[in-house]
């Protein structure tokens, strides 16, 4: 496929605001199963000084706890360093700030390396529109369709959103 291609303009600030987690994927299924360390859900994001700040919802003891994390900028524009359950190289794979965001992380915990991907959208009613893009990115990085978990309302801590 060939054609004209323009890279998106604008900075990280456009990612600020509310987001909803739609799907997770990993080559280590335990990480994204219920109670898995990466079974976490985005609530909102903001950007400052080139770093990404995220409020995430973590299911705990039947409730959802809101936790703030910061992904720190690196020399590469779409790569961030995140300390969460070990060290993560976090990459923004695909972004439409008004619609959806696909990220993936290379997680290093002790001597174990894992791959985790996350699809989030602005508008939950359009989540089906962006699942094919997520599946394509997952395939490209080596995650199969059967390693993708599409979340339900019950999964994603909807009741904990203000």
């Amino acid at each position: 496929q060939e054609g004209n291609h323009e890279e998106p303009q604008g900075g990280l600030e456009e990612l600020s605001g509310r987001w909803h987690s739609v799907a997770l994927a990993s080559n280590k299924s335990d990480l994204i199963k219920p109670w898995g360390h990466f079974r976490v859900f985005i609530h909102s994001m903001s950007a400052k000084d080139g770093n990404l700040h995220g409020d995430i919802l973590i299911p705990q003891d039947g409730q959802c706890e809101k936790v703030s994390l910061t992904a720190f900028k690196t020399a590469t524009s779409n790569k961030f360093d995140l300390e969460y359950w070990g060290h993560n190289d976090l990459y923004l794979a695909e972004v439409d700030p008004k619609s959806y965001l696909i990220l993936y992380m290379i997680n290093q915990y002790n001597d174990d390396t894992s791959l985790v991907a996350h699809l989030m959208v602005r508008d939950l009613s359009r989540q089906q529109d962006f699942l094919p893009a997520f599946e394509s990115v997952c395939e490209d990085i080596g995650l199969h369709k059967d390693q993708i978990v599409v979340l339900s309302d019950d999964d994603r801590c909807q009741g904990s959103r203000d």
Epitope: E7, T76, N78
Partner: nanobody, 116 residues
Framework: AVQLVESGGGLVQPGGSLRLSCAAS????????MSWYRQAPGKEREWVAF????????NYANSVKGRFTASRDNAKNTVYLQMNSLKPEDTAVYYC?????????WGKGTLVTVSS
């Protein structure tokens, strides 16, 4: 226009090695991951390898793990696939691919034939 051009394929004996290249143009190469796929005669296209935009991490299909190595030179806008200990079942057309903000871009492929 975005362009991906593979090269380096050819005929090689079992146990031999080849290094494929994929030259990219028309986009900011260093910002994007790259993937390798292959399609054997009469079979579906299958994913082979992936390398992050920085080149710091890779992932491989089980069938090639330990034999194939992906690398990239962002100064040259080129991604490589070093293939060692080649087997007849590695015979296929090899494609590089990237995904640029919602669109898939493929090269035209380079043929690798492993035969004695």
């Amino acid at each position: 226009a975005v362009q991906l051009v593979e090269s380096g394929g050819g005929l090689v004996q079992p146990g031999g090695s080849l290094r494929l290249s994929c030259a990219a143009s028309g986009f900011t190469f260093s910002n994007y991951y790259m993937s390798w796929y292959r399609q054997a005669p009469g079979k579906e296209r299958e994913w082979v390898a992936f390398i992050t935009s920085t080149g710091s991490s890779t992932n491989y299909a089980n069938s090639v793990k330990g034999r194939f190595t992906a690398s990239r030179d962002n100064a040259k806008n080129t991604v490589y696939l070093q293939m060692n200990s080649l087997k007849p079942e590695d015979t296929a057309v090899y494609y590089c691919k990237t995904r640029l903000w919602g669109n898939d871009y493929w090269g035209k492929g380079t043929l690798v034939t492993v035969s004695s």
